[in-house]
């Protein structure tokens, strides 16, 4: 890391060190001789998140309901706004700037993790055992059902997608 | 009251590394910046550097670049300076010095030294 | 980096006498500008900063003046405890700068 001719929170002007604006406010004008820097506190819809000499506070990100986002957490004049998505659907990239709908999980398939408003659904698919009838985005793979328990016999083994089948056992001997 | 303790004298081989510790008492460690300033025999003060106890953040001089690490341990209150690959004309008295806590700075980097450590001689000799 | 050159390297004076050093900075520096006292095998002592500033506990005999380029440190009346050397050193940008020293010798 190379040298660097002021302290932290300094910034180096005209051959001194300026002391940087704290998060929340913007630079107005550099310290001289004889006066600190001047700062002033960023507006209601802005933010600066840093320690700074930014001349403009940045604007406030904005949720919006058309794309579906909706605000998680209202911005100060420290913090950027924090979208998330509306209930049923969730954000296209880190940054949240769009929503998509939660996707299903098909027949064969049942959910693993169901969807936040920043993840999608994960499916799984069904194992030995287990089978999912039906495309969802809350259903887990369900268990076949255990014949015997019911005093009955596997007429038609199951798959991933179809329960087991059972029926009467046969009471005929050969 | 304030005290800056230093550890003891150290005779090192060139090539090899020495590592000096600070040990800082009287004051709230993380609230002031720690200097290194080295005086070779007979000459006069050079600073090497700083480090920011809080933040860890740290600062060399351009001519001990990639040689110098200077760390702390806060929960000691200790500050280390530790020197690598030396040589003949690094045999000098090091010290640590402390930042005057000054009330008044609307410019510039206000480093001035209140408080020094005793200093460690470091003898660089084959 | 800023230089700093003191003169003279070293002054020969009796106990009383009024004893000035010059520091010249190699770029304007402000009034960022401190003075030390340095003891044989001691550590420099503050003495001035701020260019004019005395430290808490220095003596009112030794004060400082000068901003931009120009600084004096000035011993009004020489005491037996002032033999040492001086060292003045810039605190605007880092790195930080020492001059090379004046020596206050006995005469």
């Known amino acids: 890391e190379p040298p660097t001719a002021c302290r932290e929170k300094q910034y180096l002007i005209n051959s001194q060190c300026c002391s940087l604006c704290q998060p929340g406010q913007k630079l107005v004008s550099d310290c001289t001789e004889f006066t600190e820097t001047e700062c002033l506190p960023c507006s209601e819809s802005e933010f600066l998140d840093t320690w700074n000499r930014e001349t403009r506070c940045h604007q406030h990100k904005y949720c919006d309901p058309n794309l579906g986002l909706q605000v998680q957490q209202k911005g100060t004049s420290e913090t950027d706004t924090i979208c998330t998505c509306e209930e049923g659907l969730h954000c296209t990239s880190e940054s949240c700037e769009s929503c998509v709908p939660h996707r299903s999980c098909l027949p064969g398939f049942g959910v693993k993790q169901i969807a936040t408003g920043v993840s999608d659904t994960i499916c799984e698919p069904c194992p030995v055992g287990f089978f999912s009838n039906v495309s969802s985005a809350f259903e887990k793979c369900r268990p076949w059902t255990s014949c015997e328990t019911k005093d009955l016999v596997v007429q038609q083994a199951g798959t991933n997608k179809t329960d087991v089948v059972c029926g009467p056992q046969d009471r005929q001997r050969a | 009251q304030v005290q800056l303790v230093q550890s003891g004298a150290e005779v090192k081989k060139p090539g090899a590394s020495v590592k000096v510790s600070c040990k800082a008492s009287g004051y709230t460690f993380t609230g002031k910046y720690m200097h290194w300033v080295r005086q070779a025999p007979g000459q006069g003060l050079e600073w090497m550097g700083w480090?920011?106890?809080?933040?860890?953040?740290?600062n060399y001089a351009q001519k001990f670049q990639g040689r110098v690490t200077m760390t702390r341990d806060t929960s000691i209150a200790t500050a280390y300076m530790e020197l690598n690959r030396l040589r003949s004309d690094d045999t000098a008295v090091y010290y640590c010095a402390r930042d005057q806590p000054l009330g008044y700075c609307t410019n510039g980097v206000c480093s001035y030294f209140d408080y020094w450590g005793q200093g460690t001689l470091v003898t660089v000799s084959s | 980096d800023i230089q700093m050159t003191q003169s003279p390297s070293s002054v020969s004076a009796s106990v009383g006498d009024r004893v000035t050093i010059t520091c010249r900075a190699s770029?304007?520096?402000?009034?960022?500008l401190a003075w030390y006292q340095q003891k044989p095998g001691k550590a420099p002592n503050l003495l001035i900063y701020t260019a004019s500033t005395l430290q808490s506990g220095v003596p009112s005999r030794f004060s400082g003046s000068g901003s931009g380029t120009d600084f004096t440190l000035t011993i009004s009346s020489l005491q037996p405890e002032d033999f040492a050397t001086y060292y003045c050193q810039q605190a605007n940008i880092f790195p930080l700068t020492f001059g090379g020293g004046t020596k206050v010798e006995i005469k």
């Open positions: 480090i920011n106890p809080d933040s860890g953040g740290t």
């Open positions: 770029q304007g520096i402000y009034s960022w």
